[in-house]
Every structure is written in structure tokens, then in C-alpha cells.
């Protein structure tokens, strides 16, 4: 789960929108029901004829997929309405880096001892941002309305509780899990923040706000300098509204544009080799904004073979401005007074 | 109660586009497939595509499929379906009506009073 | 596409008679078979869903069977209210089609 990990995870979204693995019944390692395939689903609402272009990863096979923006991915397993025709499916390898995973709450102590606050707006990245802006490692969602903050001694002592525990839908967000009764969701407070300096020798860096979409008039800055003589990234997901949502990849040393890409102009889909140590990812959104966003994974890379593409000329990186600085959250009846 | 108000009668040339709209109320209209359905004088009902007003996600007949269009205006909690390169043959009444929640989508359980689109030159 | 036929094409009975439709499907298509009623001028209206379950408040005297091409649609004791068109429309698979529809007239 952790932002420092993304080799382990097989998705990038909060939902699993972009899950595209082969577990094919509702609980992980033969466990749950059988998943029924997609192209024998027409009686329901959703089948490989509802996704021509492949756009959702439907098919002729019976894997776990979500197709409609739901929470997490599913499955169908019963071919008529009689009952539960469908199910969750448990996937273990599906969450995002960045997401820790789904704790107990008791309440006394609280798994999350820094300050907290409710909301019947949450999303998980509302809970982000005023975690961040309190200056805490750690933010947890409980209840689909309550948000936690704290910091990794914290979950040294915490008790994992199933995935599926963490239930329930953000009263923000019909697409998004916000923990459950008793039980916190906790994320790393860098998942969607507007800047950041990346050092560790792999990572995933997010669009700012993200899982949310990201906003209107985001200028945004993350510098990467990972141990190695160059480095590799690979866009898990790129979701920009139009090509006035601009994300610029320059030498850090040189200043100069290595590569740019847009809501016109995606990434490749493979991996793409740079041959700098250091570099600046700049992101801006236009006065419209509002898209998905992108994820994508970093490595160092031992050797500097560039991916042969010549750079784009030069320009000067504005500072980032500084994140969460509008964030509200309503205190939490009976909470300690925010730190 | 739940409802579906179409919009009035329309009359269009030939090679002219019709869109033809449905206010839902009294349920979540995000939540409840939409469909659309026409039936020409004297003939049997002929399905033409749906729409899942939460996300957006369409299903067309292929014998429509190069010419409707079908949208929804989620904060208007409306359904719209466009028909475009009229012909006379498009002379129909064409009904909204609500098909099943979420990934169930099993019947036409509410239907609007229908419209009537003529095509005549 | 799923062809759908309805036998007869009209019919005419007595108040109080027993009334059978028949709905043909080109291919097996399960249960998954809904009936409609339509009334002149006005929209259709569902009486029975995936072949035999009545929609709610419909009266009991409308009824369903069959299952994969062959299916009854049957009305124990017509009366002047159910003078319609009735149309039987599969969901097994895209595009959802109808029948022809029987026109039910009484004598």
C-alpha cells in the first residue's frame, strides 16, 4: 500500500476503475463466489456489449471489474435478479499506493491520535488536505463523515481489520470508500498533495486532489532526484480535461522541457526513460479543470540510456504554491482541540 | 410519485435532427437506467438504446446507432435522445421509461407519456 | 437480434373467458422475458417480469409461463378493463425486443 511500494499494486485508482488483473471470484485465493463472464451478462445492466472499445476492461472472461464507478471492483454471480446477483470481489493487490489499508477504531485511544474533524462532504482527499495542512503523516476516513489524523507510530500499534471492512461510501463521494463502522482508511498524506521532493528509489506521485478530481487554476510542482544515473516513468493513469491541462516533465539542472503532455497529448503507455537524475513535474489546469487526473510510478535507473526523443527547448518553473490552503473541515463534537 | 415528463410534439423535415427530452422525479435519477423506445403507426415497440444517468455509459441498437444520441443532464435530472438524418420511416411516438437499478436491468417499470415526432417534407 | 413472435395477432373474447398468448423467441433466452399491456394513445405499462412474476398491483388474474423460446401469457377471467394490446419483450440479450403484440378485443 504504501506510496513507496507501487511494484505490489495493481491499481492506481481509488475505486479500481483500472483494474485489469485476473482474480475471477469475490474473494481472494479461491475464496468467495465464482464470477460469472462478461459476455454471458446481457440480462443485467452490464456486459462485454456495453464495452466495445474496451474501455473498462470487459470481455469474454469472468474477472473482478468495475466498470460502472463503483467503490471497488465486482463481479456478477448469479444470471437472474433472484437474491444477490452480485458481489464485491476482495482483491488484495487492488489498492492504491498510498492507501495503508483498513484499521480498527476503537475510539479509546484512537488509532489516529492526532486531531480530527467530520464532515457530510467528505472525500478521501478532503481528509488529505486537512491532514496535511495540519502537518500530520497520516489521515484515516471512518464512517463515510470522520477524519483522522496521525503519524506512523501510530499504526505501529494499530490492528489491521479486513478490506471489506471499510465499507462505506464518502458522503462526498458516491465513487469513494471512506472507512467503516469502527474502522479507518488511512492514506499517506502526499496521495494528491500540490508539491513535494521525491528521494526514495521508487514511487508513485498523484495529480493534486487526487483520488478527487483535480480543480481549476492547480500549479503545481513535485521534484524527483531517486539514487541512480537516470530514471523511468510510467503512467498508470492520465485523465486530463483539454490541452490547456498541461503537465511538463524538465531537467532539473538545465530547466529545460523534456517533455510535455496534455489533455490532447497523452503519454506514451509504456514506460518512458529519461536520462536525467533530477527532475521538476510541473502540473497547471486551466480556470475549467476538474478531470481525473494522472498517477504515475517512478524508478532510478542504474544506467542513462535516454528514451530517444530530443528535449523541447527551456523554460522557468514557477514555485509551487503552497497546499491545503483552503480547506474547511467542521471539528468533531467531544475532539481535542486541533493542533 | 415517480414520473417521466416528455417534452411536446414535433414536426421536422427530412435530414433535420429531433431531440426530444425527459424530466424524471420522484426517485434518484442518477441511480435507475434510462431507455428509450419508439413505436411507429401501427407497429410493435422497438428499443432503441438506455443510458446509466450516474455514469454516463450507453448501450445503442445497432439500427440506431449512427444516428441517436442519448444524454442526461444529471442536476436536471433529464434524459435526452437525439435523432439525427430523419426520415419518414421516424414517424413514431418514442417513450422514455425507467429500466432497473444500478446492475440490475431487467424492465420498463415507468414511462413518460410518450412524444410524437413527425417527419414530413 | 432476438426475434420475438406473439400468436394470434388479435383476438376476441367473452367477459369472464380465459385468454392465452404465445411468445416465440428465435433463440433461448431463459426466463428472461417481461409482458406489457398498452392501452389506445397511451404508454405500455408492465404487468409481468422474467416470465411469471406479477409487477406490483397487478391484478392476479394476469399470469406467466415458459421458459427458454416458448412462453404463455394468460388472463384467468377477462375483463373490459384489460381490452389492450399486449407485447412480450425479451432481455437476455442487446437490443431488448419486442413481440408484435395481440390485440385483445371482447365479443
Known amino acids: 500500500g504504501s506510496l513507496h511500494s507501487p511494484g505490489l499494486s495493481e491499481c492506481f485508482q481509488v475505486n479500481g476503475a483500472d483494474y485489469r488483473g485476473h482474480q475471477n471470484r469475490t474473494g481472494p485465493r479461491g475464496a468467495g463466489r465464482p464470477c460469472l463472464f462478461w459476455d454471458q451478462t446481457q440480462q443485467h445492466s452490464y456486459s462485454s456489449a456495453s464495452d466495445p472499445h474496451g474501455r473498462w476492461g470487459l470481455g469474454a472472461h469472468n474477472f473482478c471489474r468495475n466498470p460502472d464507478g463503483d467503490v471497488q471492483p465486482w463481479c456478477y454471480v448469479a444470471e437472474t435478479e433472484e437474491g444477490i446477483y452480485w458481489r464485491y470481489c476482495d482483491i488484495p493487490s487492488c489498492h492504491m499506493p498510498g492507501y495503508l489499508g483498513c484499521f480498527v477504531d476503537s475510539g479509546a485511544p484512537p488509532a489516529l491520535s492526532g486531531p480530527s474533524g467530520t464532515s457530510t462532504k467528505l472525500t478521501v482527499q478532503v481528509c488529505l488536505r486537512f491532514c496535511r495542512m495540519k502537518g500530520y503523516q497520516l489521515a484515516g476516513v471512518e464512517a463515510g463523515y470522520a477524519c483522522f489524523c496521525g503519524s506512523e507510530s501510530d499504526l505501529a500499534r494499530g490492528r489491521l481489520a479486513p478490506a471489506t471492512d471499510c465499507d462505506q461510501i464518502c458522503f462526498g463521494h458516491p465513487g469513494q470508500l471512506c472507512g467503516g463502522d469502527g474502522r479507518l482508511g488511512v492514506y499517506e498524506v502526499s496521495v494528491g498533495s500540490c508539491q513535494g521532493n521525491w528521494t526514495a528509489p521508487q514511487g508513485v506521485i498523484y495529480s493534486p486532489d487526487f483520488p478527487d478530481e483535480y480543480g481549476p487554476d492547480r500549479n503545481c510542482s513535485w521534484a524527483l532526484g531517486p539514487p541512480g544515473a537516470a530514471l523511468e516513468l510510467t503512467f498508470r493513469l492520465f485523465e486530463l480535461a483539454d490541452p490547456r491541462d498541461r503537465l511538463e516533465l524538465r531537467d532539473a539542472a538545465s530547466g529545460s522541457l523534456l517533455r510535455a503532455f496534455d489533455g490532447a497529448r497523452p503519454p506514451p503507455s509504456g514506460p518512458l526513460r529519461l536520462g536525467t537524475a533530477a527532475l521538476l513535474l510541473t502540473f497547471r489546469s486551466d480556470a475549467r479543470g476538474h478531470a481525473q487526473g494522472f498517477a504515475l510510478t517512478y524508478r532510478g535507473l542504474q544506467d542513462a540510456a535516454e528514451d530517444p526523443e530530443a528535449p523541447e527547448g527551456s523554460a522557468q518553473t514557477p514555485a509551487a504554491p503552497l497546499d491545503g490552503a483552503n480547506v474547511s473541515c467542521s471539528p468533531r463534537p467531544g475532539a481535542p482541540p486541533a493542533a | 410519485q415517480v414520473q417521466l415528463v416528455q417534452s411536446g410534439a414535433e414536426v421536422k423535415k427530412p435530414g433535420a435532427s429531433v431531440k426530444v427530452s425527459c424530466k424524471a422525479s420522484g426517485y434518484t435519477f442518477t441511480s435507475y437506467w434510462m431507455h428509450w423506445v419508439r413505436q411507429a403507426p401501427g407497429q410493435r415497440l422497438e428499443w432503441m438504446g438506455n443510458?446509466?444517468?450516474?455514469?454516463?455509459?450507453?448501450h445503442y441498437n445497432e439500427k440506431f446507432k449512427s444516428r441517436v444520441t442519448i444524454t442526461r443532464d444529471t442536476s436536471a435530472s433529464t434524459a435526452y435522445m437525439e435523432l439525427s438524418s430523419l426520415r419518414s420511416e421516424d414517424t413514431a411516438v418514442y417513450y422514455c421509461t425507467r429500466g432497473g437499478y444500478g446492475k440490475g436491468d431487467w424492465y420498463f417499470d415507468v414511462w413518460g407519456q410518450g412524444t410524437t415526432v413527425t417527419v414530413s417534407s | 437480434d432476438i426475434q420475438m413472435t406473439q400468436s394470434p395477432s388479435s383476438l376476441s373474447a367473452s367477459v369472464g373467458d380465459r385468454v392465452t398468448i404465445t411468445c416465440r423467441a428465435s433463440q433461448d433466452i431463459s426466463n428472461y422475458l417481461n409482458w406489457y399491456q398498452q392501452k389506445p394513445g397511451k404508454a405500455p405499462k408492465l404487468l409481468i417480469y422474467?416470465?411469471?412474476r406479477l409487477h406490483s398491483g397487478v391484478p392476479s388474474r394476469f399470469s406467466g409461463s415458459g421458459s427458454g423460446t416458448d412462453f404463455t401469457f394468460t388472463i384467468s377471467s377477462l375483463q373490459p378493463e384489460d381490452i389492450a394490446t399486449y407485447y412480450c419483450?425479451?432481455?437476455?440479450?442487446?437490443?431488448?425486443?419486442f413481440g408484435g403484440g395481440t390485440k385483445v378485443e371482447i365479443k
Open positions: 419483450q425479451q432481455y437476455s440479450k442487446l437490443p431488448r425486443t
Open positions: 443510458i446509466y444517468p450516474g455514469s454516463g455509459i450507453t
Open positions: 422474467y416470465t411469471s
